[in-house]
């Protein structure tokens, strides 16, 4: 009983339950392959509990191992379109600080119009995650088709 | 030591560890696009710890943020079949209560025969999740090819 | 405050936070469809906290329900290649002890060059997970394209 009470009284953030689920806000201007994200209850079912958005990119606030997941669906896309515009590629990586820059997750669309994946990776406070979509097809902004999130798993 | 003991003595449900992994039971009759699920150790590796099944649909018992994941494989399917029967689409959503009805996750098969994805989403006690498969191709009931699950992540 | 301190003082393993993320080491010789994995901070962003590697296969050290996830990308692959060499199939399963041998997760590549999925499954101490890739195409060893991991979720 004492433990259950303690668990409820402590702020969730102190338990390391950082979590975020984002929806697509917009794509970048030409020459900027980054996707720009947004989150918050006013926008629907997206949220940020711990991590923050910095100019549409996700910044981590707590060191730890995270489950990173993403789904991106291309708008106005058929398998024919996808193969004609191939290769369209999505990469999720740490883009800042520059010293920690690395690609964490990469997928190509080939003849499909949706990619979805997830992975465990260590992230540090201050790491900013960028999602780069290269190719000529636009992503859908439907919140059930395109989303990006992280979940703190352990220190 | 005291904490570890307390953790073991408390029922897991009080820790908020609601989790479920389901296998396909059957598809609906014509005009009903829903997939009907089943779970329990007698059936193999599926289980329900917290959530419940209501006429083959998954009902949530604890408020919180959940990781929802799904994989559906179409039976008797090749890339040729898939493209010929296109579009086949899977949508996971809250279907009741009606006031909270919303699509959470949507994917099309295009030229593939399997879709798999996952996302974080807030769910409330009483939310029922439905998985709608629209199209003319039948899903496989093999337990390693088609499954659907949720995992409570945080309040 | 006392709980937070207790949480920090206890070894993480006693909290049941077993987790691993592996990168591809090599494929097996002919007639051996298994992928051989490696992990550890010296190798990049892969790690093992709890589970161990046994001749390139992942061995579980703690009973519980796990989230198992995998992404495999085929090297030197286009949708044309993938369909010509089709079907290439990936299966994740318990391969030892033999008495518990079972396929947990299975996907075909069809006309794509990447598969990614995840599922919840009960695993027991001593279970060894094998990932079998059948077909004539080789997997990429890029750490952002091919990876395999598990995360303990609850007892």
């Amino acid at each position: 009983q004492r433990f259950a009470q303690a668990q409820q009284q402590l702020p969730l953030e102190s338990l390391g339950w950082d979590v975020a689920e984002l929806q697509l806000n917009h794509t970048g201007p030409q020459q900027d392959p980054r996707l720009y994200w947004q989150g918050g209850p006013a926008l629907g079912r997206s949220f940020l509990h711990g991590p923050e958005l910095d100019k549409g990119q996700l910044r981590i606030h707590r060191d730890g191992i995270y489950m990173v997941h993403i789904q991106v669906t291309l708008a106005i896309c058929s398998s024919t379109t996808a193969s004609r515009h191939h290769p369209t590629t999505l990469a999720v990586g740490i883009c800042s600080p520059a010293s920690r820059s690395i690609s964490l997750l990469r997928l190509s669309f080939h003849q499909g119009c949706t990619i979805a994946s997830q992975r465990l990776t260590p992230l540090a406070r201050g790491d900013t995650l960028c999602t780069n979509l290269t190719g000529t097809l636009l992503p859908s902004r439907n919140t059930d088709e395109t989303f990006f999130g992280v979940q703190w798993v352990r220190p | 030591q005291r904490f570890a003991q307390a953790q073991q003595q408390l029922p897991l449900e009080s820790l908020g560890w609601d989790v479920a992994e389901l296998q396909l039971n059957h598809t609906g009759p014509q005009q009903d696009p829903r997939l009907y699920w089943q779970g329990g150790p007698a059936l193999g590796r599926s289980f329900l710890h917290g959530p419940e099944l209501d006429k083959g649909q998954l009902r949530i018992h604890r408020d919180g943020i959940y990781m929802v994941h799904i994989q559906v494989t179409l039976a008797i399917c090749s890339s040729t079949t898939a493209s010929r029967h296109h579009p086949t689409t899977l949508a996971v959503g809250i279907c009741s209560p009606a006031s909270r009805s919303i699509s959470l996750l949507r994917l099309s098969f295009h030229q593939g025969c399997t879709i798999a994805s996952q996302r974080l989403t807030p769910l409330a006690r009483g939310d029922t999740l439905c998985t709608n498969l629209t199209g003319t191709l039948l899903p496989s009931r093999n337990t390693d090819e088609t499954f659907f699950g949720v995992q409570w992540v945080r309040p | 405050q006392r709980f937070a301190q207790a949480q920090q003082q206890l070894p993480l393993e006693s909290l049941g936070w077993d987790v691993a993320e592996l990168q591809l080491n090599h494929t097996g010789p002919q007639q051996d469809p298994r992928l051989y994995w490696q992990g550890g901070p010296a190798l990049g962003r892969s790690f093992l906290h709890g589970p161990e590697l046994d001749k390139g296969q992942l061995r579980i050290h703690r009973d519980g329900i796990y989230m198992v996830h995998i992404q495999v990308t085929l090297a030197i692959c286009s949708s044309t290649t993938a369909s010509r060499h089709h079907p290439t199939t990936l299966a994740v399963g318990i391969c030892s002890p033999a008495s518990r041998s079972i396929s947990l997760l299975r996907l075909s590549f069809h006309q794509g060059c990447t598969i990614a999925s995840q599922r919840l499954t009960p695993l027991a101490r001593g279970d060894t997970l094998c990932t079998n890739l059948t077909g004539t195409l080789l997997p990429s060893r890029n750490t952002d394209e091919t990876f395999f991991g598990v995360q303990w979720v609850r007892p």
Epitope: - | Q30, D32, A75, L138 | -
Partner: antibody, heavy 120, light 107 residues
Amino acid sequence: EVQLVESGGGLVKPGGSLRLSCAASGFTFSSYSMNWVRQAPGKCLEWVSYISSSGGYIYYAESVKGRFTISRDNAKNSLYLQMNSLRAEDAAVYYCSRGDYSNYAYFDYWGQGTLVTVSS
Amino acid sequence: DIQMTQSPSSLSASVGDRVTITCRASQGISNYLAWYQQKPGKVPKLLIYAASTLQSGVPSRFSGSGSGTDFTLTISSLQAEDVAVYYCQQYYSTPLTFGCGTKVEIK
């Protein structure tokens, strides 16, 4: 014991119709996909049609599409094949067969078959 | 459509012989292949599914192997009661298709 018993075969003129039935017993009929497979005398086996356990998914061989209709009545544990615009090449023994539980279509039980003859 | 080609179309072997029948698919079908036995005047009987899984009640002298496009049915020690026509069938995609059979006889 699983049993599948076909009926309804017979002699019919080209352009005519027949309705085949298959009565199932010994298993939970509503849990399994069902199929019709035919075999002309001295010829290979040919798959004709597939229906899912709930009846929501139906597939046909190209040679019968638009002429044959598969259906089932789970309350009566029965499978049907309505055959219209019959042709000489439709003459065969028609087998009712059970698909496997996973919804894939290999056939683990077969009926004894019913003979359809199409001749003027 | 996926064509299934069986060879040989017929064979004759002695009791106790090891018999091998092959089935080739016109395109890859993974392991979605079944083998059936049809004895004279009888209905087909499922022997093997998923290319290599023995159906319950089938004698262990029957085995299947292969993946992709090339498959084999082996009878390790032919018995008099194995005289039959053997068919392969793919269930990878519709239309479902059968091979035209291999007739096995005793010398």
